[in-house]
Amino acid sequence: MAVTACQGLGFVVSLIGIAGIIAATCMDQWSTQDLYNNPVTAVFNYQGLWRSCVRESSGFTECRGYFTLLGLPAMLQAVRALMIVGIVLGAIGLLVSIFALKCIRIGSMEDSAKANMTLTSGIMFIVSGLCAIAGVSVFANMLVTNFWMSTANMYTGMGGMVQTVQTRYTFGAALFVGWVAGGLTLIGGVMMCIACRGLAPEETNYKAVSYHASGHSVAYKPGGFKASTGFGSNTKNKKIYDGGARTEDEVQSYPSKHDYV
């Protein structure tokens, strides 16, 4: 029951996380700038991974997509790649984990197969979460670096002059959404990996079937193991070959895929 709950919770947490990663990737507010020194109107500028927008105090808003790949900073391309890889891995992980859920029966799928699928999806979620966290962190670092570099960026050309406008660079909402979503996906992945351990069927202590002779306390052990009578030193029918860890009666009290005669 605890395993099913852990697996189910891991799936839900990962699902929320991946939805958050998708939302963050699509959002326009990765970074924002307030242009206080604008001589005409208050301008609020914000950028995403795919387009840049401007909003003026008059209410005018305009967004333009980055239609060229050549003019974009390599870091921005890297962030895009990390977020997309995170989404793809997360989506595949979700697909795999749906079939791995203990509460869903698909044909005669064995517990071992479900355990493997749970582990696979868990690892995918972990990598997906790490990709998202890495992507958001790289972008945040790029903003901080740009803020400090902007004071020294000025050059002249063709009689005119180009200089960086001093703006207040702030982290956009998408960065926080991305960090939280990445964290949730990571936690969900860890939960799936933990659930996998509980799903894996425990190795049975013996490979043979016990046959009890009627009327006698004798257990035949096919495959060359010692047979024991109900007398002498092995009165509790302890399995001789495994160091006497459990009695046969104790072992039989656990459900197993082996039939008992």
């Epitope: 700038q33 005409v40 500028n45 003026e56 008059s58 005018f60 900073p73 902007s150 960026n153 960086t164």
Partner: nanobody, 121 residues
Framework: EVQLVESGGGLVQPGGSLRLSCAAS????????MVWYRQAPGKQRELVAG???????NYAHSVKGRFTISRDNAKNTMYLQMNSLKSEDTATYYC???????????????WGQGTLVTVSA
């Protein structure tokens, strides 16, 4: 590299008219605000008129009602229609633009080299 090129300046008689143009060229993603400044000999540079991307305008008190600023966003060009010119309008007129540059993820302030307007009889 982003460049602003002013044109349309020259000698004009008092009461006359001139139309200045400022064209932005180069690898620029989006120009948001465009402004005309002027600097008379021995004086501080002052704002004449400005226009935002959305069309919001701002004029200096001394030119209100005489000058009209406009722009073409598609062509990244700004215009200043100057009517009823006075001798005190004599100055070098500079074009200024605040532009968003995706290549550096920064706002850039670009200045033109200026065009001389002389109002004299």
């Amino acid at each position: 590299e982003v460049q602003l090129v002013e044109s349309g300046g020259g000698l004009v008689q008092p009461g006359g008219s001139l139309r200045l143009s400022c064209a932005a060229s180069g690898n620029i993603f989006r120009i948001d605000t465009m402004v005309w400044y002027r600097q008379a000999p021995g004086k501080q540079r002052e704002l004449v008129a400005g226009i935002s991307r959305g069309g919001t305008t701002n004029y200096a008190h001394s030119v209100k009602g005489r000058f009209t600023i406009s722009r073409d966003n598609a062509k990244n060009t700004m215009y200043l229609q100057m009517n009823s010119l006075k001798s005190e309008d004599t100055a070098t007129y500079y074009c200024n633009a605040q532009a968003w540059d995706v290549g550096t993820i920064r706002y850039l302030e670009v200045w033109g080299q200026g065009t001389l307007v002389t109002v004299s009889a």
